[in-house]
């Protein structure tokens, strides 16, 4: 029988009756177009909907849309569209909701074609007022609020100009002109590639790269001859063109851009590209693509100096640049993340890394099922997840892969189990473990979504006929109990609930299609009455991430520490609730040479856990850039992996000497930097 | 070979403490949660609560809860149990077991080894 | 807590008899159950983990089934040494055990 299907799967006792008295239905008085949604603040129940329908007249398209708001999580909606004054309102820039609990939200008016600039609609009560504010500029860009403070915001003009406000989007001023990309980094600080000749296409590569740490009033020139710039974690980089040809190499500053490294990376030619995959404060992921039309590239892992990098991961998967690569974090666990390889046969292997890029290895075959045709040996396969790159070649792939923070070890994705990624009609496999062992948990492909921190997953078949039935589960995906929510079976668009998986709530999106008409509905379901007590301490269990061989006494040791978690059981069927936190106890343990990456000039052959040096650096002095200076470094080849929190056992030495000399190539030397004020 | 040696019998009064020791040998001491269940004359197994020594961390029944403080002692591979406020139905012969363990679940798998058992009388 | 409920209570039975135990969860608790066996004066032995599983050593006329809240031990064939005393007991949090089978001789 499928999984979760079996007589003994323990049934939630009268939950027809429980969830019949708790699924609220809204029929949208609207023509069917597009619809989208935002959540407006964490925990406040907010979400707006704003669907647009456009008429396609002789000449030109005329445009409607409404605004739609509810305060109960989706049960109840109210029609606002009149407190925008019934504007047409552009869906390309959505709804820029403030971050954190701010409650702002800009919405970007469509205007028309002979005004001086465009128009906004501001909120700061969680859309219950709105006011209008004409532009001076015609945004290019949605509004982006600086993360620190709510009240600033920038944007981008057509005519790249690069345009701040102070309060909130009541007045706006322009800071700079020959603007091609802005962001904002931290303290309020704002960076910005501008160009001198043409425009951000002729003079790329020749980009400057600035810097406003007071919204315009001064400004720095923090690097010239710059392709393109990023941010991650407390890194920034910059791709510089090389002086004599046409590559370019990575640099990067953990000083807002006072100084600057290159980084030991290879460089990329016109057609290649470099990409940050993930960062945090400790460490980066970078992709650097192969030469050629390959569709693959290395991912290479950073020290905590963004500086030195180690090799993580052949073949990887990303055809162009903002291509599709299929590289996800597993956020339900610490050090785990899962993407694509390309193989030398071009099919397409799943990998999965335990130790934030130490290792790869293939995902386990899942013990309940069998190897399709992909697979050589019938007994020997393994799982392959279905991401990005599935659902771009138009697979038959509603989701990418799901995990949460808070709901611990959970990973939901779907997959084929053989030699390779199939292109058959995939199932949905679960994980409780972080992607350490699988389970198919429903046949076929399915929307899923998961609710309380773990205790209830969701899902709704994909199909393409009309669909009244969501199946739920209470038991981390082992048995599913459907429940249909309508008679009248709806077109399925989507799935919504409050991110960050704490809810109770999931709201079903669709229309429904009549003769003359269609209209956009929504079914709201609240799971409150199926887990009708809260969670208490006899409804978790203990549970050591990351767990191999109880009898290695560094059983769980990830980046030199392990956590156990308190995890729900999977036969309490109780709510953790809105307020719930995950629980996790840390135990240091003792350092090995897994806790460290290899410096500077040294590499790991492969299956060995020892640092050798470089063939090429045999016997020259190890002399390097850093900050602008000639760094001499005597090391015996290891340095700490970052994030890394062993203490005790191997302890390799390492010292660095600054040489005082300055290093002549790098193209961001502090010298070439300049300021300026307005 | 795996097992669990544990401190002799015990005679006590009734309001005493009684703490019970339980020597591992032959596997990773660290890696297994070590439970404690008791069995009264003529009568059933009884879970008290179990310990992960890495951690620290102890897990106890709801009816011993505030009687019963479970420990262990990394470097000498033990593990104590200790009951307090005795009264006479708490004569019982008092078992450790290791929690078998497959994979991060400490509890899911049964208790796979046993100590002898301890006898503990409760008596005036 | 999860209530275990073993049935019967004693059974009596002859060497070479199939003889099959039942044990009920009063809510599902999967597959985290195991069985024991005990003989006067001994501790326990495990048989029989996560429902269905032989613990290694353990003769295979033992076998386990059962998921959810309904579970079963079966002995296949019973032989002198299986007289004893056998308990469930559900793994899946705070443990429990049931109340026991005593298997005695017809």
């Known amino acids: 029988s499928a999984p979760g299907e079996d007589e003994e799967c323990g049934r939630v006792r009268d939950f027809v009756a429980k969830l019949a008295n708790n699924t609220h239905q809204h029929v949208f008085d609207d023509l069917r177009g597009s619809v989208s949604l935002s959540w407006v603040g964490d925990s406040t129940g907010v979400i707006l909907v704003l669907t647009t329908f456009h008429v396609p007249l002789v000449i030109m398209t005329f445009g409607q849309s409404k605004l739609y708001r509810s305060e109960d999580y989706g049960k109840n909606f109210k029609d606002i569209t009149d407190l925008i004054n019934n504007t047409f309102i552009r869906t390309e820039f959505g709804m820029a909701i403030g971050p954190e609990n701010s409650g702002k939200v800009v919405l970007t008016a469509e205007v028309s074609g002979g005004s001086r600039g465009g128009r906004i609609f501001r909120s700061s009560d969680f859309a219950k007022n709105f006011v209008q504010t004409d532009l001076p500029f015609h945004p290019l860009t949605q509004m982006m609020y600086s993360p620190q403070n709510s009240d600033y915001l920038l944007a981008l003009s057509t005519e790249n100009g690069l345009w701040v406000s102070k309060n909130f989007g009541g007045k706006w001023e322009e800071i700079h002109k020959a603007v091609c990309l802005a962001k904002w980094g931290s303290d309020n600080t704002i960076f910005f590639t501008t160009y001198a000749n043409g425009s951000c296409k002729a003079d790329l590569g020749a980009l400057e790269l600035w810097r406003t740490s007071d919204l315009g009033k001064s400004f720095k020139t923090i690097g010239v001859k710059i392709y393109s710039f990023g941010l991650g974690g407390r890194f920034l980089f910059a791709s510089v063109m090389a002086d004599k040809d046409t590559t370019r190499r990575i640099h990067v500053s953990t000083d807002q851009g006072d100084t600057w490294s290159m980084a030991q990376l290879p460089s990329v030619g016109q057609e290649q590209f470099y990409s940050i995959l993930a960062a945090n404060d400790d460490m980066v992921f970078m992709h650097v693509d192969e030469p050629g039309d390959t569709g693959f590239g290395t991912i290479f892992t950073s020290d905590d100096r963004g500086i030195v990098y180690s090799k993580s991961l052949d073949r990887h998967l990303y055809t162009t640049t903002g291509g599709e690569t299929d590289f996800t974090n597993v956020t339900s666990l610490r050090g785990v993340y899962i993407t694509s390889v390309l193989s030398e046969d071009n099919s397409i292997q799943t990998m999965i890394t335990f130790d934030q890029g130490g290792r790869w290895t293939h995902l386990r075959k899942p013990e309940n099922s069998e190897c399709d045709a992909t697979a050589k040996n019938k007994n020997e396969c393994s799982l392959h997840i279905h991401a990005s790159y599935s659902i771009s070649q138009k697979l038959n792939v509603p989701m990418a892969p799901l995990s949460e923070p808070n709901a611990v070890g959970i990973v939901i994705a779907h997959g084929s189990v053989g030699d390779a990624i199939s292109v058959m009609v995939p199932d949905v496999y679960i994980s409780d473990d972080g992607g350490y062992s699988w389970t198919k948990m429903l046949e076929g492909p399915h929307y899923y979504t998961i609710l309380d921190s773990g205790g209830i997953i969701v899902a709704i078949e994909h199909s393409s006929r009309p669909i009244n039935v969501i199946k739920f589960s209470t038991d981390e995906g082992q048995c599913w109990q459907t429940y249909t929510f309508t008679r009248d079976p709806i077109y399925f668009t989507g799935l919504a609930s409050e991110p960050g998986a704490r809810s109770m709530n999931i709201s079903i999106w669709g229309f429904t299609e009549s003769f003359l008409t269609s209209q956009w509905v929504s079914y709201t379901i609240d799971f409150k009455d199926i887990l009708e007590r809260n969670c208490e301490e006899k409804d978790y269990t203990i549970w050591l991430a990351h767990s191999t061989d109880p009898e290695d006494y560094e059983d769980g040791c990830i980046l030199g520490y392990k956590e156990q978690f308190l995890r729900l059981r999977k036969s309490s069927v109780c709510q953790n609730g809105r307020d719930y936190v995950v629980t996790k106890q840390p135990s240091i343990c003792l350092c090995s040479l897994e806790d460290f990456l290899c410096d500077f000039g040294y590499y790991r052959p492969e299956n060995d856990s020892k640092c050798v040096e470089q063939p090429e650096l045999k016997g020259h002095d190890l002399e390097f850039c850093l900050y602008g200076r000639e760094e001499h470094l005597t090391t015996n080849g290891y340095r700490k992996i970052p994030g890394d929190k062993c203490q005790g056992g191997v302890n390799p030495v390492r010292e660095v000497k600054d040489l005082k000399k300055k290093c002549t190539s790098n193209f961001l030397s502090p010298e070439k930097q300049n300021s300026k004020s307005n | 070979q795996v097992q669990l040696v544990q401190s002799g019998a015990e005679v006590k009064k009734p309001g005493a403490s009684v703490k019970v020791s339980c020597k591992a040998s032959g596997y990773t001491f660290t890696g297994y949660a070590m439970a404690w269940v008791r069995q009264a004359p003529g009568q059933g197994l009884e879970w008290m609560g179990g310990?992960?020594?890495?951690?620290?961390?102890?897990w106890y029944a709801q009816k011993f809860q505030g009687r019963v403080t479970i420990t262990a002692d990394e470097s000498t591979s033990t593990a104590y149990m200790e009951l307090s406020s005795l009264r006479s139905e708490d004569t019982a012969v008092y078992y450790c077991?290791?929690?078998?363990?497959?994979?991060?679940?400490?509890?899911?798998?049964?208790?796979?080894?046993w100590g002898q058992g301890t006898t503990v009388t409760v008596s005036s | 807590d999860i209530q275990m409920t073993q049935s019967p209570s004693t059974l009596s039975a002859s060497v070479g008899d199939r003889v099959t135990i039942t044990c009920r969860a009063s809510q599902s608790i999967s597959s985290w159950l195991a069985w024991y066996q005990q003989k006067p004066g001994k501790a326990p032995k495990l048989l029989i983990y996560k429902a269905s599983s032989l613990e290694s050593g353990v003769p295979s006329r033992f076998s386990g089934s059962g998921s959810g809240t309904e579970f079963t031990l079966t002995i296949s064939s019973l032989q002198p040494d299986d007289f004893a005393t056998y308990y469930c007991q559900q793994a899946d949090g705070h443990i429990t055990f049931g109340g026991g089978t005593k298997v005695e001789i017809k």
């Open positions: 077991a290791r929690q078998g363990r497959k994979t991060g679940y400490y509890y899911y798998y049964g208790m796979d080894v």
């Open positions: 310990i992960i020594p890495t951690f620290g961390t102890a």
